[in-house]
Interface confidence: medium
């Protein structure tokens, strides 16, 4: 299970019309579920229960996006449509770049990832938890434009891609 | 400031293929997508396809396929548009032109100055 | 693809009057995303207005954008001399991005 180097990227609008950005970097586990890879996209909050429906119906996501998706506690749903596994099989085949999964509420999801699977996805699927986890959702609740870099060795410019 | 400069007219031969180049300065080439637009003389705008100056990915028009290419190197801070198999109908202006990547933000906001493409035998 | 259909083609006006450019979309533009270009002779496009109704950095209050779905128009309130040019509108919200015809806006 190697660590996921999470880079997000926040883009605040000003009334001029110009963006300025904000860095946060956070890190995170790749799973077993899917390829040790990385990936990049315009970070697109889902629900765990809005991947239950199976309307492909998605806005153009031109560049490539990330689905993140903040689990809930087993007990709040007894009996989930899909696996976490298969909620992330799920945002892959709606055009996700990469899937995150915010695990702190529910850490068995964990083993659930890491179970040898014999068909990996071949996008990455990312877990984190904690002080990262609130970091990441702390940011995603915000509501705004939001980019997330996923890399599987430490960036060596950290604000490379979006210093602007 | 940002800016976008292209390299120079080209002329060439039907068949032949052209490479046009768009040096970006005063930004962070790698944080934007570039396009590449074309206009042939008297048309409307024709848009030909985008690279991300940060991973490299690209997206081409169908009408475009095959015959396009976008590439970038992110050291000279330079995105690159290559058309083949060149014919009298693709004399035009070629643009190249940012974009922030982000739904909601501007699209094409800054673009260059403009290469002139003219295909004659 | 979307095809996106300008009029008039051409508006002849005087310094002072009003502009209403119009924008037809094939079918609905995804999330009003259509953009407004401003093109002079010999120059690049220059970026207007986005997401249907946003001014781009730097662009003046007499240029505004509206509508949504299929519908759009650019609405420049007192023309300036410098605003006599050809204009064109974009769809970004799918892919391939379109561009219309252009409305050429001369003096009187």
């Known amino acids: 299970k190697e660590t996921a180097f999470v880079e997000v990227v926040l883009f605040e609008s000003s009334p001029s019309g110009d963006y300025t950005t904000y860095t946060t970097g956070l890190t995170g586990r790749f799973s077993r579920a899917g390829a040790t890879l990385s990936a990049e996209g315009e970070i697109v909050q889902m629900h765990p229960l809005g991947l239950c429906n199976n309307n492909d119906e998605e806005d153009l996501y031109e560049y490539g996006w990330v689905g993140v998706v903040k689990l809930e506690q087993p007990e709040l749903d007894p009996k989930p449509c899909l696996t976490v596994l298969g909620k992330a099989k799920r945002a892959v085949q709606r055009g996700a770049t990469a899937v995150i999964f915010d695990v702190s509420e529910n850490p068995e999801a964990i083993d659930q990832l890491n179970q040898g699977s014999e068909d990996p996805l071949k996008r990455p699927v990312v877990y984190v938890k904690g002080a990262d986890a609130i970091k990441l959702m702390n940011i995603v609740n915000k509501q705004k434009v939001a980019r997330a870099r996923i890399q599987h060795r430490p960036p060596r410019q950290p604000t490379e891609y979006f210093d602007m | 400031e940002v800016q976008l400069v292209q390299s120079g007219a080209e002329v060439k031969k039907p068949g032949a293929s052209v490479k046009v180049s768009c040096k970006a300065s005063?930004?962070?080439?790698?944080?934007?997508?570039m396009h590449w637009v074309r206009q042939a003389p008297g048309q409307r705008l024709e848009w030909m396809g985008w690279?991300?100056?940060?991973?490299?990915?690209?997206k081409y028009s169908q009408t475009f396929q095959g015959r396009v290419t976008i590439t970038r190197d992110t050291s000279a801070s330079t995105a690159y548009m290559e058309l083949s198999s060149l014919r009298s109908e693709d004399t035009a202006v070629y643009y190249c032109?940012?974009?922030?990547?982000?739904?909601?933000?501007?699209?094409?906001?800054?673009w260059g100055q403009g290469t002139l493409v003219t295909v004659s035998s | 693809e979307i095809v996106l259909t300008q009029s008039p083609g051409t508006l002849s006006l005087s310094p002072g009057e009003r502009a209403t450019l119009s924008c037809r979309a094939s079918q609905s533009v995804s999330s009003s995303y259509l953009a407004w270009y401003q093109q002079k002779p010999g120059q690049a496009p220059r970026l207007l207005i986005y997401g249907a109704s946003s001014r781009a950095t730097g662009i003046p209050d007499r240029f505004s954008g509206s509508g949504s779905g299929t519908d759009f128009t650019l609405t420049i309130s007192r023309l300036e001399p410098e605003d006599f040019a050809v204009y064109y509108c974009q769809q970004y919200g799918s892919s391939p991005r379109t561009f219309g015809q252009g409305t050429k806006v001369e003096i009187k």
């Open positions: 005063g930004y962070t080439f790698t944080s934007y997508a």
């Open positions: 032109a940012r974009d922030l990547m982000v739904r909601g933000g501007p699209p094409f906001d800054y």
């Open positions: 690279i991300n100056a940060g991973n490299g990915n690209t």
